[in-house]
């Protein structure tokens, strides 16, 4: 399903057409917005009786919930709304129609305020959490642009002084449930996340307790994205690493790219003693290069029994026809020199050039410094 | 919103040099390919080339010789130079985030050749 | 270099019914790089279909791509009056990116 299907109807009816039987059609209204679904016969024949469905439930027909062979609408949607709504055949319990339905409050960004929050001694003797801040935490839907820092917050206050700690969908959530990992700020009662992705949507809950209680508040992300986009990196942590002479390295990087994009592992080098070529750009060898069908492609780089040369710099590069996107990644290797020292394993490896994006193809053996475009991702010809 | 305004003479004499100049505004002109793309007066539309922000370039093999596009990063402004030109380049001219397929274009602005 | 035809030239439909638009490319085309564009009188082209089958932000459902190798197709579900304009194809997987002739939709 492309990314340019999903809508967004703020502040007004929207009546939104039946998918074809099969596809989930994905609906994104504002609170307060009458949700209107339209599931016509399919093929224009006669419908037959229907049941509407919710998250597996029948609907039962309201003052606000109106509900009819063909159409339903839910007046004055709320959060509560949210969720699978299909419409059925009554006797064979047919899918004809499936939309996928949220209800958000308008676009907004995290707190970004420092410092704030902290805890704080109250001259309350002993007594169970509660928020500090609870006016701050209104915004419970957050609709944020990809690639954007994400900050949930909960201040709070108790004694003994409360602890902290985040679902996912009702799930613990730790760092390493996140390519990019998380930051845990737990004097600021915050989470962080930097460089959001698609796979971060979802619920997250803080949960605050001590032993006289515990109170939690839950917070929906969406992350909004245009189609097409610049590809979007996620560079697994540590983006440092230190390894011992000899053993095994695993750079991460997660690209999420709706048009295929053209990855590629890379390594700054020196040639005759110098890191960057004549027009002040730095050398690189391709370590590994390929076009990736799928909108979220996990690439690792693996660096076996490594030796001193290893050390130094990697990238991680994605290119589409919109744009580049890049992360770094240091490696420093120490210990005893290695008897023999072996190289990369790649792909494609060997190519030097100098060059923000150039490739060497077949176009580009003239010596100019061009782009990476699409022709030159189908045939490398590395020199 | 991303959007893009092309400015220029819209006129230009037989043998001289074409120049236009492309604002982004609502963006950074970083990381992101931009193009420019002309369409002729029978309607057909022709790919000129496209830059990178970090001022890598390429252009369409046909217009190569006479064909320089350039980036001012600080100005959020890219550049369009077509030289000797002859009445067979007039056409409107757009200016587009992409490096081959586009997403965002100018509104366009027509360019003449003639003495 | 890759040389796209559009057919028809020009196809009269009435609103409701369905469009199908046809570009051939000389050369087939790797991974899909195909994109349609919709040209309304005295504007810029618009992105509607990138990667062949893509829909760009904000295009309506009723526009769809489809197709691979030398042949694809526009189709436009549910014609609406705004529709009946001019449709470009291009492909982005050769240098110099090429453009189709266009295909304009007329009202019958």
């Known amino acids: 399903e492309s990314l340019g299907t999903e809508q967004r109807v703020v502040g007004r009816a929207a009546e939104v057409p039946g998918p074809e039987p099969g596809q989930q059609e994905q609906l994104v209204f504002g609170s307060g917005d009458a949700v209107e679904l339209s599931c016509p016969p399919p093929g224009g024949g006669p419908m037959g009786p229907t049941v509407w469905v919710k998250d597996g439930t029948g609907l039962v027909p309201s003052e606000r919930v109106l509900v009819g062979p063909q159409r339903l609408q839910v007046l004055n949607a709320s959060h509560e709304d949210s969720g699978a709504y299909s419409c059925r055949q009554r006797l064979t319990q047919r899918v004809l129609c499936h939309f996928s339905v949220r209800v958000t409050d308008a676009p907004s960004s995290g707190d970004d305020e420092d410092g704030e929050d902290e805890a704080e001694d109250t001259g309350v003797d002993t007594g169970a959490p509660y928020w500090t801040r609870p006016e701050r935490m209104d915004k419970k839907l957050l609709a944020v642009p990809a690639a954007n820092t994400v900050r949930f917050r909960c201040p709070a206050a108790g004694n003994p002084t409360p602890s902290i700690s985040w679902l996912k969908n009702g799930r613990e959530f730790r760092g390493e449930h996140r390519i990019g990992g998380i930051k845990l700020r737990h004097q600021q009662w915050s989470l962080v996340m930097e460089s959001v992705v698609p796979s971060d949507r979802g619920n997250y809950t803080c949960v605050v307790e001590n032993k006289f209680g515990s109170i939690r508040q839950t917070y929906t992300l969406d992350v909004l994205e245009r189609s097409p986009h610049r590809p979007i990196l996620q560079a697994g942590l540590p983006a440092n690493q230190t390894a011992v002479l000899g053993s095994d390295v695993e750079f991460h990087c997660k690209v999420y790219s709706d048009a295929q994009p053209h990855i590629q592992w890379l390594k700054h080098v020196e040639v005759n003693g110098s890191k960057v070529g004549p027009d002040g750009t730095p050398y690189v060898t391709v370590l590994k290069s390929w076009i990736s069908e799928s909108v979220e492609a996990d690439v690792r780089l693996r660096l076996a029994n490594v030796s001193e040369r290893d050390g130094g710099e990697y990238l991680c590069r994605a290119t589409n026809f919109i744009g580049v996107a890049e992360k770094a990644f240091w490696l420093s290797v120490h210990g005893p020199r290695a008897a023999e020292e072996e190289l990369v394993e790649a792909d494609e490896a060997g190519s030097v050039y100098a060059g923000e994006q150039k490739l060497i193809s077949e176009e580009d053996l003239g010596g100019e410094q061009k782009l990476i475009s699409e022709e030159d991702l189908h045939h490398h010809h590395h020199h | 919103q991303v959007q893009l305004q092309e400015s220029g003479p819209g006129l230009v004499k037989p043998s001289e040099t074409l120049s236009l100049t492309c604002t982004v505004s609502?963006?950074?002109?970083?990381?992101?390919?931009w193009s420019w793309i002309r369409q002729l007066p029978g309607k057909e539309l022709e790919w000129i080339g496209h830059?990178?922000?970090?001022?890598?370039?390429r252009y369409n093999p046909s217009l190569q010789s006479r064909v320089t596009i350039s980036i001012d990063t600080s100005k959020n402004q890219f550049s369009l130079k077509l030289s000797s030109v002859t009445a067979a380049d007039t056409a409107v001219y757009y200016c587009?985030?992409?490096?081959?397929?586009?997403?965002?274009w100018g509104q366009g602005t027509l360019v003449t050749v003639s003495s | 270099e890759i040389v796209l035809t559009q057919s028809p030239g020009t196809l009269s439909l009435s609103p409701g019914e369905r469009a199908t638009l046809s570009c051939r490319t000389s050369?087939?085309?790797?991974?899909?790089?195909l994109a349609w564009y919709q040209q309304k009188p005295g504007q810029a082209p618009r992105l509607l279909i990138y990667?062949?089958?893509r829909r760009a932000t904000g295009i309506p459902d009723r526009f769809s791509g489809s197709g691979s190798g030398t042949d694809f197709t526009l189709t436009i579900s549910r014609l609406e009056p705004e529709d009946f304009v001019v449709y470009y194809c291009?492909?982005?997987?050769?240098?110099?990116?090429?453009f189709g002739q266009g295909t304009k939709l007329e009202i019958k």
């Open positions: 587009a985030r992409g490096a081959s397929a586009v997403d965002y």
């Open positions: 609502g963006d950074s002109i970083n990381s992101y390919f």
């Open positions: 830059i990178y922000s970090s001022g890598s370039t």
């Open positions: 050369q087939s085309i790797s991974s899909g790089y």
């Open positions: 990667g062949a089958s």
């Open positions: 291009q492909q982005y997987g050769s240098s110099p990116y090429t």
